[in-house]
């Protein structure tokens, strides 16, 4: 028998990914990080 | 609030084609995932599904009498068809029109009923 | 198609006492998806019929909380706690897995 129509059974969580860098100073570099959803992961 | 109503022709005869309407209201066609079924059920019988129609018009026919159905929408008046064509006594039942809708925020159950509508086939 | 099967057919009561009907698909209704689309409906005398449980065990709202399913795979069982004059009628098991959708025969829950 074929399956009836049926939604996914997981939810999909849309988040928004952010690239930022920011300038810690001359002799330092930079740090560059990636947060999602609120953490930064990178 | 949610309403679904049946209607019908009430008496018909053999091989004729029979045409249902089920009018909604509380609710829209045109939303996302919301979907309608029609089920009958001959006097003192159990229940048979018998075709269901989505909104974006996928539809799904019970394959025992899929030739002889064609369930069909109209979307802007809210309303839902089901035709039977070559109608015969064992076609004589009560018709009702149930919704269901999918989703992960919907419960995926036929929720609401029409009061159903009598059809009877004689010649 | 997927035969469910309900037993008993017919079931006395007095009020007050606990009900349990059974119902039995023929084989899995485990959906692709990972839910298993096993619901009961209530159908009193000249009404339509009205949802008490959907997938397998989650009551609709507003049914009380004497109603209680559970089950898996091709077993299910509905179980009212305690029986009140109001939950009289025939109650219907239901897959909504597989094509055709199918019901059980029904089971009349009636008094001794």
């Known amino acids: 028998d074929a399956e009836f129509r049926h939604d996914s059974g997981y939810e999909v969580h849309h988040q928004k990914l952010v690239f930022f860098a920011e300038d810690v100073g001359s002799n330092k570099g930079a740090i560059i990080g990636l947060m999602v959803g609120g953490v930064v992961i990178a | 609030q949610v309403t679904l109503k049946e209607s019908g022709p009430g008496i018909l005869k053999p091989s004729q084609t029979l045409s249902l309407t089920c009018s909604l209201s509380?609710?829209?066609?045109?939303?996302?995932?919301?979907?309608v079924g029609w089920f009958r059920q001959p006097s003192g019988k159990g229940l048979e599904w018998l075709a269901h129609?989505?909104?974006?018009?996928?539809?799904s026919y019970n394959p025992s009498l899929k030739s002889r159905l064609t369930i069909s929408k109209y979307t802007s008046r809210n309303q839902v068809f089901l035709t039977i064509t070559s109608v015969d006594t064992a076609d004589t039942a009560t018709y009702y029109c149930?919704?269901?809708?999918?989703?992960?925020?919907?419960?995926?159950?036929?929720?609401?009923w029409g009061q159903g509508t009598s059809v009877t086939v004689s010649s | 198609d997927v035969l469910m099967t309900q037993t008993p057919l017919s079931l006395p009561v007095s009020l007050g006492d606990q009900a349990s009907i059974s119902c039995r698909s023929s084989q899995s209704i485990l959906h692709s998806n990972g839910n298993t689309y096993l619901e009961w409906y209530l159908q009193k005398p000249g009404q339509s019929p009205k949802l008490l449980i959907y997938?397998?065990?989650n009551r609709f709202s507003g049914v009380p909380d004497r109603f209680s399913g559970s089950g898996s795979g091709t077993d299910f069982t509905l179980k009212i706690s305690r029986v009140e004059a109001e939950d009289l009628g025939v109650y219907y098991c239901f897959q909504g897995s597989l094509v055709p959708l199918t019901f059980g025969a029904g089971t009349k829950l009636e008094l001794k």
């Open positions: 129609i989505w909104w974006d018009d996928d539809k």
């Open positions: 149930a919704r269901r809708q999918l989703g992960l925020r919907s419960i995926d159950a036929m929720d609401y």
């Open positions: 997938k397998v065990s």
């Open positions: 509380g609710f829209s066609l045109s939303t996302s995932g919301m979907g």
